[in-house]
Interface confidence: medium
């Protein structure tokens, strides 16, 4: 079965200066490749958290998401403030030569 | 061709400290987890801890958590395993070990460098 | 932790026969399951990752097989060059154990 990128809280709900849990779970360990957090679609978008590389200080993982057999790419973004508001996505990216390529999101 | 080459190895007391180093080359070392394996004198080898690619995750055997630290510095292509509080049963040779694939661990180790030697004794 | 027992410890064949090393685990690791070679005084060599798959640059007669908790490795035809200690290791959960090693002698 094909790989399904599930973010079950439609909304959440978080206090300014709180911390937000963002939570994102894939079905299958295949194809093996690495996630993005985005906020926004299209072109325009936000990257929120990068698995394979850049400095996010404020973005912390559930769980350690460079182990392979992990399927779970949640993540918490501290000291929340109004202008984090919006639409979160997990994307989940195939492994390729030379880049990676998107492959489903939540 | 891909490379480790560990150092730092020698003969200490026990309660005392040491660092190894393991220098990497040949391949992008910034892209791999990494991990340190040791094995004592005519004993099989044992798992001590692993460090993802960017040094964002570490995890250690319960041996040897709370007294060794791995680290790396990618701008070095260097690993590091800080190990304090030694004891006699740490005596063994210490490997580092490259993961096979990039930006993940649980595949294994398909690098492995030569090991340098760590006795404690008194 | 997951304990990997392997069996036997120490074993004696004749070139040309076929040797079998099996490691059990003590709960199911799916088939993240490696095999090292060892020789004496050297670094260990990954042979097989994933229970089966071959690492690169390995000769035919090494094999593996299993998923879940029972594996075995194979030697189809021993060579004096196979002279070693043979180690699987699973790669499902940290810490990531090792078998206790199987050494494999020529008759």
């Known amino acids: 079965e094909e790989l399904q990128v599930i973010q079950p809280d439609k909304s959440v709900l978080v206090a300014a200066g709180e911390t937000a849990t963002l939570r994102c779970t894939a079905t299958s360990l295949i194809p093996v490749g690495p996630i993005q957090w985005f906020r926004g679609a299209g072109p325009g978008r936000e990257l929120i958290y990068n698995q394979k590389e850049g400095h996010f200080p404020r973005v912390t993982t559930v769980s350690d998401l460079t182990k392979r057999n992990n399927m779970d790419f949640s993540i918490r973004i501290g000291n929340i403030t109004p202008a984090d508001a919006g639409t979160y996505y997990c994307v989940k990216f195939r492994k390729g030569s030379p880049d990676d390529v998107e492959f489903k999101s939540g | 061709q891909v490379q480790l080459v560990e150092s730092g190895g020698g003969v200490v007391q026990p309660g005392r400290s040491l660092r190894l180093s393991c220098a990497a080359s040949?391949?992008?070392?910034?892209?791999?987890?990494m991990h340190w394996v040791r094995q004592a004198p005519g004993k099989g080898l044992e798992w001590v801890a692993v460090?993802?690619?960017?040094?964002?995750?570490?995890y250690y055997a319960d041996s040897v958590k709370g007294r060794f630290t791995i680290s790396r510095d990618n701008s070095k292509n260097t690993l590091y395993l800080q190990m304090n509080s030694l004891r006699a049963e740490d005596t063994a040779v210490y490997y580092c070990?490259?993961?096979?694939?990039?930006?993940?661990?649980?595949?294994?180790?398909?690098?492995w460098g030569q090991g340098t030697t760590v006795t404690v004794s008194s | 932790d997951i304990q990997m027992t392997q069996s036997p410890s120490s074993l004696s064949a004749s070139v040309g026969d076929r040797v079998t090393i099996t490691c059990q685990a003590s709960q199911d690791i799916s088939n993240y399951l490696n095999w090292y070679q060892q020789k004496p005084g050297k670094a260990p060599k990954l042979l097989i990752y994933d229970a089966s798959n071959l690492e690169t640059g390995v000769p035919s007669r090494f094999s593996g097989s299993g998923s879940g908790t029972d594996f075995t490795f194979t030697i189809s035809s021993l060579q004096p060059e196979d002279i070693a200690t043979y180690y699987c290791q699973q790669v499902d959960v940290l810490p990531y154990t090792f078998g206790g090693g199987t050494k494999v002698e020529i008759k």
């Open positions: 040949g391949f992008t070392f910034s892209s791999y987890g």
């Open positions: 460090i993802s690619y960017d040094g964002s995750n570490k």
């Open positions: 070990a490259k993961e096979p694939r990039s930006y993940w661990h649980g595949y294994g180790m398909d690098v």
